[in-house]
Interface confidence: medium
């Protein structure tokens, strides 16, 4: 396996003033090992590996305002350990493909 | 730490429980990329229970195979294509 | 079946620029380091670049022989693999191979390429 | 850069003959965390593309006769062909593969007698 902390960009929208601002962050990103069973059991499902956090802390960023909107502040999670492990559905959005750490619904972004 | 992709790639190797001397039932196995990160809020105003991280992923999968009868009465599978694609069981 | 297949190699004045691309079919290309090796006539090989695989971001790295004169990089949707060769000198003249991961475990046939007067 | 260093250089021998070359790196290729060594041997045959004979020192790649062997850890290394055969003729490379700079031994020439 070759799951791993990795630098990447987050963008964090700043709905009423429609813009972004991009921050730099640690998150997961790697291969994992799997295996589909050529006997399957229903009684006994394999579960598949997805490299995700092992442990994760929350920061907190200000964002900044515009005309009518004050300065606000947004809590993020950060990851700070990885490992190929089962995806938490609880705390975790389970998907083949998602938006992205970067997306963003408006056009202006701020550094 | 060494500098290499060191998963093997999701490539079809034999699977030694339910092969037999030339009759060998060949299984998908290897890595495939996967990686998670803050849910984005366009994401997060879609949810009818909110989830702080995504995490996207992909498995090492049958993309075809053969159903086959062996030892035992046992139906199993016999992988004949790999690819990396959506995982089934990879929630907890 | 993997398979690694050069071109663009040729005869080239020494000053001049040169592509090479390498063609890959049979995995998935974006899972796996790349690199390209040369060998010079008669003499051994040598590494001098590679781009990581899109774990890693595609990041490269390159021998001091020919660091700020080739620059590698894929165009990902059609799995290939450039080598852009800038300010060509003689000792550049070799057979240039591609080949996948970093324990080389596939190779191309090679190109070759002259840089001479 | 982690030197790498063959010898011997050339070696001629005869069909049937059991021969070792030798690689020795100038830093140790072992990783401590899952205990292998990142080391590869190639064989290049006249007019051909190298081909990938042994992986992690000792590992044989799919394919590849058993009479090829590796061995060595650390910073020592060694390639056995137990039996010679004629189409064994080629140059033998050693190469790193813990850290960039990649970088290949300088190679040993399998002659026939």
């Known amino acids: 396996n070759s799951c791993e902390l990795t630098n990447i960009t987050i963008a964090i929208e700043k709905e009423e003033c429609r813009f972004c601002i991009s921050i730099n962050t640690t998150w997961c990103a790697g291969y994992c090992y799997t295996r589909d069973l050529v006997y399957k059991d229903p009684a006994r499902p394999k579960i598949q590996k997805t490299c995700t956090f092992k442990e994760l802390v929350y920061e907190t960023v200000r964002v900044p305002g515009c005309a009518h909107h004050a300065d606000s502040l947004y809590t993020y999670p950060v990851a700070t350990q990885c490992h190929c492990g089962k995806c938490d559905s609880d705390s975790t959005d389970c998907t083949v493909r998602g938006l992205g750490p970067s997306y963003c619904s408006f056009g202006e972004m701020k550094e | 730490a060494p500098d290499v992709q060191d998963c093997p790639e999701c490539t079809l190797q034999e699977n030694p429980f339910f092969s037999q001397p030339g009759a060998p039932i060949l299984q998908c196995m290897g890595c495939c990329f996967s990686r998670a990160y803050p849910t984005p809020l366009r994401s997060k105003k879609t949810m009818l229970v909110q989830k702080n991280v995504t995490s996207e992923s992909t498995c090492c999968v049958a993309k075809s195979y053969n159903r086959v009868t062996v030892m035992g009465g046992f139906k199993v599978e016999n992988h004949t294509a790999c690819h990396c694609s959506t995982c089934y069981y990879h929630k907890s | 079946e993997v398979k690694l297949v050069e071109s663009g190699g040729g005869l080239v004045q020494p000053g001049g620029s040169l592509r090479l691309s390498c063609a890959t079919s049979?995995?998935?290309?974006?899972?796996?380091?790349m690199e390209w090796v040369r060998q010079p006539p008669g003499k051994r090989l040598e590494w001098i670049a590679a781009s990581r695989n899109k774990a890693k971001d595609y990041t490269t790295e390159y021998s001091a022989s020919v660091k700020g004169r080739f620059i590698v990089s894929r165009d990902t949707s059609q799995s290939i693999l450039y080598l852009q060769m800038n300010a060509l000198r003689a000792e550049d003249t070799a057979i240039y191979f591609c080949?996948?991961?970093?324990?080389?475990?596939?190779w191309g046939q090679g190109t070759l390429v002259t840089v001479s007067a | 850069d982690i030197v790498m260093s063959q010898s011997p250089s050339s070696l001629a021998v005869s069909v049937g003959e059991k021969i070792t070359m030798s690689c020795k790196s100038s830093q140790s290729l072992l990783y401590s965390s899952n205990q292998k060594n990142y080391l590869a041997w190639y064989q290049q045959k006249p007019g051909q593309s190298p081909k990938l004979l042994i992986y992690w020192a000792s590992t044989r790649e799919s394919g590849v006769p058993d009479r090829f062997t590796g061995s060595g850890s650390g910073t020592d290394f060694t390639l056995t062909i137990s039996s010679v055969k004629a189409e064994d003729l080629a140059v033998y490379y050693c190469?790193?593969?813990?850290?960039?700079?990649?970088?290949f031994g300088g190679g040993t020439k399998l002659e026939i007698k």
């Open positions: 080949a996948r991961d970093a324990r080389f475990a596939y």
């Open positions: 190469q790193q593969y813990y850290s960039y700079p990649r970088t």
């Open positions: 049979g995995f998935t290309f974006s899972d796996f380091y």
